[in-house]
Every structure is written in structure tokens, then in C-alpha cells.
């Protein structure tokens, strides 16, 4: 039975040209995290695997950095980076947990962070 909860940074905004950290945290489960995939819509951004380390997908290598932790840092943000991001936790024995983050990249200097929220 899946008892875990994914906590994410929720709805966030950042300035064009700046950087942002996407963070997810899996709690309330003893399941072993095998791999975390980061995806933007249906595109693979990055993988963090317990045995094999980090992989950043080739099309994002210049602007995506691994970490901190199982999180992901997006750099040199453009307005095109606005959208949904997903952290997909592949765990054993629970299965797959998915967290959602919505990032809005703003032209102006008014970029406030949204509240944290949970996805069961």
C-alpha cells in the first residue's frame, strides 16, 4: 500500500535570466527510492539513480544542474520555461509517486514564491 506523501515547492515564480530550485520531498513511507525522474510536460529533464548517479538530458545540459539533494536547479530562465514540472519517485516496494510544480517565469522583477503544498 502506498502511504507516502510528496511535498513540493508548489507554484513558484522566478525572473527571466535568473535561476530556480525545483524541490520534492517524499515522506511518510519507508520505501526505498530507486530513481527520481524530473520531467517537463512529457520531456525528460534529468534522472537521479541510487546506483548510477545523475543524468541530465542532452537538450538541457547547458541550463540544468543536479541538486541540491534530489532536487534540480534551472538556470538562465526564459519565458518558455514557464509550465509544469514533475518529480517522479520510483520506489520499492510502494511504486511510483509523482509531485507537480508549476513554474512561471516573469519578465518583471516581481517574482514571488508560492506556498508549499502537498500531493498525496
Amino acid at each position: 500500500m502506498m502511504t507516502g506523501t510528496i511535498e513540493t515547492t508548489g507554484n513558484i515564480s522566478a525572473e527571466k535570466g535568473g535561476s530556480i530550485i525545483l524541490q520534492c520531498h517524499l515522506s511518510s513511507t519507508t520505501a526505498q527510492v530507486t530513481q527520481v525522474n524530473w520531467e517537463q510536460q512529457d520531456q525528460l529533464l534529468a534522472i537521479c539513480n541510487a546506483d548510477l548517479g545523475w543524468h541530465i538530458s542532452p537538450s538541457f545540459k547547458d541550463r540544468v544542474a543536479p541538486g541540491p539533494g534530489l532536487g534540480l536547479t534551472l538556470q538562465s530562465l526564459t519565458v518558455n520555461d514557464t509550465g509544469e514540472y514533475f518529480c517522479i519517485y520510483h520506489t520499492y516496494p510502494d511504486g511510483t509517486y509523482t509531485g507537480r510544480i508549476f513554474l512561471e517565469v516573469l519578465e518583471s522583477s516581481v517574482a514571488e514564491h508560492g506556498a508549499r503544498f502537498q500531493i498525496p
Epitope: Q32, T34, Q35, N37, L44, I47, N49, D51, L52, G53, H55, S57, P58, H90, Y92
Partner: antibody, heavy 120, light 110 residues
Amino acid sequence: EVQLLELGGSLVQPGGSLRLSCAASGFTFDDYVMSWVRQAPGKGLEWVSLINWNGDKTYYADSVKGRFTISRDNSKNTLYLQMNSLRAEDTAVYYCARHWIVFQYGLDVWGQGTTVTVSS
Amino acid sequence: QSVLTQPLSASGTPGQKVTISCSGVSSNIEIKYVSWYQQLPGTAPKLLIYNSHQRPSGVPDRFSGSKSGTSASLAISGLQSEDEADYYCTSWDDRLKSWVFGGGTKLTVL
């Protein structure tokens, strides 16, 4: 169409060397962990070696450790297996295989195999 | 000697259900995922089951996988003559840090 094509198999004398290659097409090669698996005549499948996305993590079966080297060239979408100090027991059909995006899930795409015969 | 243990052979008649077992240890099957492969004579292996119980698209639902403790099994229902092949189980071994295979099971459709 997703395809793997192995090349380089041949007849080689004991103690000799050989380099196998596997050309990948139809998918983003960089995003996948790859393995070599072999099958001796009339025998079962034996995993040989595994390499992560950028080649900085490799694993080997005890039977080939110190003699075989797995590598990849992502710019050429090609996987390699350098085989040194070959023995009669290395005679087999060698398959390259792609791992599922979560590499521990399984090997989802296989090549047709290339035959290596070690004999004097 | 394979790390995972499978019966050498299995058989059944058309329409029957056949189950193939795969036995491992605490460092592989018990804490990791199992995948199953079908190898028809003279061909490359084909993935049947991944993540212990999931079927890739194109694999008939006659094939199913399950797992309990250090053992896994592949069930084939409604057996057909074209199912005659070798079947292999495999898993990642957390202690050995290697991909381990079963010795294979030759399935005969009588």
C-alpha cells in the same frame, strides 16, 4: 523505429582481442543505460557489463572483470565492448540491450546479436 | 551456476496455464524488480514483463508476472504452440552490483 545493431564479431585466437560495437537508432541514446549480454552455444543468457548514461559508471560480471571494457560514444549513438585476453569460454553470441528508463526495471530493446568465436 | 534459480523445463497442453518460478535471495528479487524474457529458437530475447508485473505494449495479457519474498513467477494462460521457447528471469543484485539472470526454462507445448 528503435533499433540496436551489433557489429564486430569474428573468429579470434585465445589471448587475442576484439572490439564489438552497437549502433543505436530511433531513440535518444544519451538517456538510456546500456548493457552487453552474451549467450554461449546451447547455454543461457549471461549479463556481461553495464554502463550509465555518460559512461562514468560501469559494472562488470566477475567472469570478464579486468579483461573487458564497456564504453559509449553518445555523439555517435554507439556502445562498445573492448574484449582482451579472450578465452575459449568467451565464445558466444553477444547482444547489446537497452535498459528501461528506470534501469532496474528490465532490458526493453535488444539487438540481433553478433557471434564471437575464440578458438585456435 | 546462475544466481537466480529456474526449473530447467516446463510443459503444458494448448489452452492450459503454466507457471515458471524464479528463486533468488534477499539482495535481488526480495528488494528489487524482476523482468522476464522470451527467447524463441534462433532469435534475440524479447521483454515480456518488467517491474515485476508490468507488460510492455504488444505483449498479450496471457502473460503475467508476480513476486513474493525472494521468489518470482511468470504465468502463461491459454497456452499456444507459439509460446514454445526459453524463458529467463533477471533482476539487479544490490550486493553484487550486477544484473543477474536465471538459468532459463525451456517451455514445451505438448
